[in-house]
C-alpha cells in the first residue's frame, strides 16, 4: 500500500490556445486529468489501473501552480494504491479548459483539450522528488514526482505492514525495510521476551520486565544463583534447593548439632587446651597454675605452701615470695641460722641435732608437718581427688567435689546412668561413656524399649499343608486357617484320619 | 491440533470467589509464543477480555476487574486458572479460555468451548 | 478507556458483498482482529494482523485498517457466513473487543 504523488509547479501556455490551435474566450481556464496505469511500452489510451485524479480550474493560460498539500492536499496530487508496488508505471496528464463550472468528462466538448502528454518508466519507492518538464508546440508543462508508502507500510515496495508497538505481544519500531527494531530491553523474533538483569541465571531466573530477575522456586539472591537450603537448615549449606549440608563441625537434619564446641564457643579459658567429647561436651586441659572445669579459676602459688620453716608466703605477679621468721633465710626459708638449743620445733616435736650441732631436724608428731613442724598436714597435697574432683579442707578430714558423672569418696566412680533402670519391658542397660544403651527383649524397640513391636508369629510357617498362617497381634500367636481336608490346630492332620494319641 | 478444555463449577454465590481451569492438550503452555487468555460472554452480549498470562507467570488485566481478578499458570500441568473474587449476577456469562498469539499479532487462534457460570443465590 | 465501535446489524442477500466497519481513535496504527461467532459456539478468528487469513478460512474473508477505521469485507457472502462478528484491538496491554455486528 502507497501512493504515487504528483506535484504540478508550472503550465505554460502563452497564446491561451487549445490543442486545435483555436484560442479560449476570454482565456483558458485550465484543469488536469491525471491516469496512472501499469507500464506499457507505447502508452494507450485504456484503463487507468493504478487510479485516475482530477483538479479543480488551477488557472488561465500560464500559471504557476502553488504547493497546497496544507490547505487541503490538492497538490501534490495523491493516487493511492492497495498493492506491492510494481517499481515500473505509465502516466497520461491532460490540461483541459473549462468554459463552465462543471468540469466532468461528458459535460465538456471533445475540443476542449489544451494538451496531453504521457511518459512512462521505472519509479522507485523513496522519499526524493522527480523533476520532468514536457513541452509540445504550444504548452510546457513543469511537475515532479515521486512514490511513497502508506502508513505502516514499508519495503522496497510497499509491501510490508509493520506498526510499531509497545504492549505484551512486542516492544518494536519499524525498520524502514519493514522489520521489527526492538526497543532498549527486548529481544526475540517479536520483541517479546524482556533482557534479564545481565547474569540472571538462564534456568533459575526469568523476568517479565528488561533488567529485572525474578526467581524459580527454590532459588534467590539477586541473580538467583544461590539456592535456598531446607527451612530450618542452621548451619549447613545446599547446591541444589531444598538441601541442608552440614558445616564442618555441625551434624543433624538441620545442621543445628554441634559437633566442634570448642572451635564454636572456645570456652576452656586462661590458654587451656579444649577437646571435643562428643555432641556439646568437651574437655579443658589446663594449663600450670589454672584449675576449674573451663579452666577459669586462677592458682595461687601459695597454695601449694612453698614456704618452710613457718615462712610466710606472698603471692606476686611473677610467682611468690617468702618472709622467713627469725632464724632462716633462703628462697622458700629452708636454710636455719637455729640448733636445738634455740627450741625451733613447734607442736611438740622433737629437735635432733645435725652436722656437730650446725645443723637439726625436727620429728613432728601425727597431723604436723614442715621443716619446724609448724604447718599442720593438708590433706589435698596428695591431690586425692580422681577424674578432676577439687579437693577441699574441711578441718581434721577433707572431700572431694566431683565433676558431672562421677561421684564416690575420691570421685574414683563413674555415676551409672543405668542405676535409674531406664530400660522399659526388660530390656538391659549398657553403660557408655556418653550415655546408654538399651538392648530389647523380643516384641520391643526403641531407644529405651518403649514401643512394642509386633511379633510376627508366623515368620516361622507353623501351619502345614499349605494353610493360611494369620498373626494374633494382641497374643502375638498364629492362628492356621486349613485348607479344605485338614485340621489341627496347624492342620497337620487329614481329615478321616484321627490323631494317633500316646495315651 | 492444540485443544483447551475450561472446568469448574456452574454455579457460584454471590459475594464468593469464582474459580475455573483451562486445561490445554496437544502443545505445551511453555511456548514462548503465546500468551493464554480468559475471554466472556454475558448471555446475549458481547465479547469482554478479562486477562491473560505467559507462561513465566506475567500477567495483564482489564482495569475494569483488575481488583478481583487473578490468572495463575501451572506449566507442570500444563493448566492456567482464573479466580473472580466477590463475584454478583453481573458476572453470570459464558467463560472462554483462549491462545492469544503473538505471531498473529495478538489475535487469539485457538479456543475452549467455553462453560456457563451462573451467580445466584 | 479505548473503545471499538461496531454496526449492530449488517444486512446482505447471498452472492452480494458485507462490509463492516470497526471505528476507534487512531485504529489505523493499531493491529486489528476479526472473529466469526455462530450461535452456540466459540468464537473463531478470521483476520488477523489487519488483513492476513489463518489457514483454512476463505478467500472471501478480508480486512483492510486506515484512520480511524477497520473493515472486514465478505465477498460474495454465503448462507453460512450468518453470524456475529467481533473486531478486537490491543491497547496498551489490555484487550479490547468491538460491540458486534450481526450479519444476516
Known amino acids: 500500500s502507497g501512493v504515487f504523488q504528483l506535484q504540478l509547479q508550472e503550465f505554460i501556455n502563452e497564446r491561451g490556445v487549445l490543442a486545435s490551435g483555436r484560442p479560449c474566450e476570454p482565456g483558458c481556464r485550465t484543469f488536469f486529468r491525471v491516469c496512472l496505469k501499469h507500464f506499457q511500452a507505447v502508452v494507450s489510451p485504456g484503463p487507468c489501473t493504478f487510479g485516475t485524479v482530477s483538479t479543480p480550474v488551477l488557472g488561465t493560460n500560464s500559471f504557476a501552480v502553488r504547493d497546497d498539500s496544507s490547505g487541503g492536499g490538492r497538490n501534490p496530487l495523491q493516487l493511492p494504491f492497495n498493492f506491492t508496488w510494481p517499481g515500473t508505471f505509465s502516466l497520461i496528464i491532460e490540461a483541459w479548459h473549462a468554459p463552465g463550472d462543471d468540469l466532468r468528462p461528458e459535460a465538456l466538448p471533445p475540443d476542449a483539450l489544451i494538451s496531453k502528454i504521457a511518459i512512462q518508466g521505472s519509479l522507485a519507492v523513496g522519499q526524493n522528488w522527480l523533476l520532468d518538464e514536457q513541452t509540445s508546440t504550444l504548452t510546457r508543462l513543469r511537475y515532479s514526482y515521486r512514490v511513497i508508502c502508506s502508513d505502516n507500510y514499508y519495503g522496497d515496495n510497499c509491501s510490508r505492514l509493520c506498526k510499531k508497538r509497545n504492549d505484551h505481544f512486542g516492544h518494536y519500531v519499524c525498520q524502514p525495510d519493514g522489520n521489527l527494531s526492538c526497543l532498549p530491553g527486548w529481544t526475540g523474533e517479536y520483541c517479546q521476551q524482556p533482557i534479564c538483569l545481565s547474569g540472571c541465571h538462564e534456568q533459575n531466573g526469568y523476568c517479565s520486565k528488561p533488567a529485572e530477575c525474578l526467581c524459580r522456586p527454590g532459588w534467590q539472591g539477586r541473580l538467583c544463583n544461590e539456592c535456598i537450603p531446607h527451612n530450618g537448615c542452621r548451619h549447613g549449606t545446599c547446591s541444589t534447593p531444598w538441601q541442608c549440608t552440614c558445616d564442618e563441625g555441625w551434624g543433624g537434619l538441620f545442621c543445628d548439632q554441634d559437633l566442634n564446641y570448642c572451635t564454636h564457643h572456645s570456652p576452656c579459658k586462661n590458654g587451656a587446651t579444649c577437646s571435643n567429647s562428643g555432641q556439646r561436651s568437651y574437655t579443658c586441659t589446663c594449663r600450670p597454675g589454672y584449675t576449674g572445669v573451663d579452666c577459669e579459676l586462677e592458682l595461687s602459688e601459695c597454695d601449694s605452701n612453698p614456704c618452710r620453716n613457718g615462712g610466710s608466703c606472698k603471692d606476686q605477679e611473677d610467682g611468690y615470695h617468702c618472709l622467713c621468721p627469725p632464724g632462716y633465710y633462703g628462697l622458700h626459708c629452708e636454710h636455719s641460722t637455729l640448733s636445738c638449743a634455740d627450741s625451733p620445733c613447734f607442736n611438740g616435736g622433737s629437735c635432733r641435732e645435725r652436722n656437730q650441732g650446725a645443723n637439726y631436724a625436727c620429728e613432728c608428731p601425727p597431723n604436723f608437718t614442715g621443716s619446724n613442724c609448724e604447718k599442720k598436714v593438708d590433706r589435698c597435697t596428695s591431690n586425692p581427688c580422681a577424674n578432676g574432683g577439687q579437693c577441699l579442707n574441711r578441718g581434721p578430714s577433707r572431700m572431694c567435689r566431683c565433676r558431672p558423672g562421677f561421684t564416690g569418696t575420691y570421685c574414683e566412680l563413674h555415676v551409672s546412668d543405668c542405676a535409674r533402670n531406664p530400660c522399659a519391658h526388660g530390656g538391659t542397660c549398657h553403660d557408655l561413656e556418653n550415655g546408654l544403651m538399651c538392648t530389647c527383649p523380643a516384641g520391643f524397640s526403641g531407644r529405651r524399649c518403649e514401643v512394642r513391636t509386633s511379633i510376627d508369629a508366623c515368620a516361622s510357617s507353623p501351619c502345614f499343608n499349605r494353610a493360611t498362617c494369620y498373626t494374633d497381634l494382641s497374643t502375638d500367636t498364629f492362628v492356621c486357617n486349613c485348607p479344605y481336608g485338614f485340621v489341627g490346630s496347624r492342620c497337620e492332620f487329614p481329615v478321616g484320619l484321627p490323631p494317633s494319641f500316646p495315651w | 491440533e492444540v485443544q483447551l478444555q475450561e472446568s469448574g463449577p456452574g454455579l457460584v454465590k454471590p459475594s464468593e470467589t469464582l474459580s475455573l481451569t483451562c486445561t490445554v492438550s496437544?502443545?505445551?503452555?511453555?511456548?514462548?509464543?503465546?500468551?493464554w487468555g480468559w475471554i466472556r460472554q454475558p448471555p446475549g452480549k458481547g465479547l469482554e477480555w478479562i486477562g491473560d498470562i505467559y507462561y513465566t507467570g506475567s500477567t495483564y488485566y482489564n482495569p475494569s476487574l483488575k481488583n478481583r481478578v487473578t490468572i495463575s499458570v501451572d506449566t507442570s500441568k500444563n493448566q492456567f486458572s482464573l479466580k473472580l473474587s466477590s463475584v454478583t449476577a453481573a458476572d453470570t456469562a459464558v467463560y472462554y479460555c483462549a491462545r492469544e498469539s503473538v505471531p498473529l499479532g495478538g489475535g487469539a487462534d485457538n479456543w475452549g468451548q467455553g462453560t456457563l457460570v451462573t451467580v445466584s443465590s | 478507556s479505548y473503545e471499538l465501535t461496531q454496526p449492530p446489524s449488517v444486512s446482505v442477500s447471498p452472492g452480494q458483498t458485507a462490509s463492516i466497519t470497526c471505528s476507534g481513535e487512531?485504529?489505523?496504527?493499531?493491529?486489528v482482529s476479526w472473529y466469526q461467532q455462530k450461535p452456540g459456539q466459540s468464537p473463531v478468528l478470521v483476520i488477523y494482523e489487519d488483513s492476513m487469513r489463518p489457514s483454512g478460512i476463505p478467500e472471501r474473508f478480508s480486512g483492510s485498517n486506515s484512520g480511524d477505521t477497520a473493515t472486514l469485507t465478505i465477498s460474495g457472502t454465503q448462507p453460512m457466513d450468518e453470524a456475529d462478528y467481533y473486531c478486537q484491538a490491543w491497547d496498551s496491554e489490555v484487550g479490547v473487543f468491538g460491540s458486534g455486528t450481526k450479519v444476516t
Open positions: 496437544g502443545g505445551s503452555i511453555s511456548s514462548g509464543s503465546y500468551y
Open positions: 487512531s485504529l489505523g496504527d493499531k493491529y
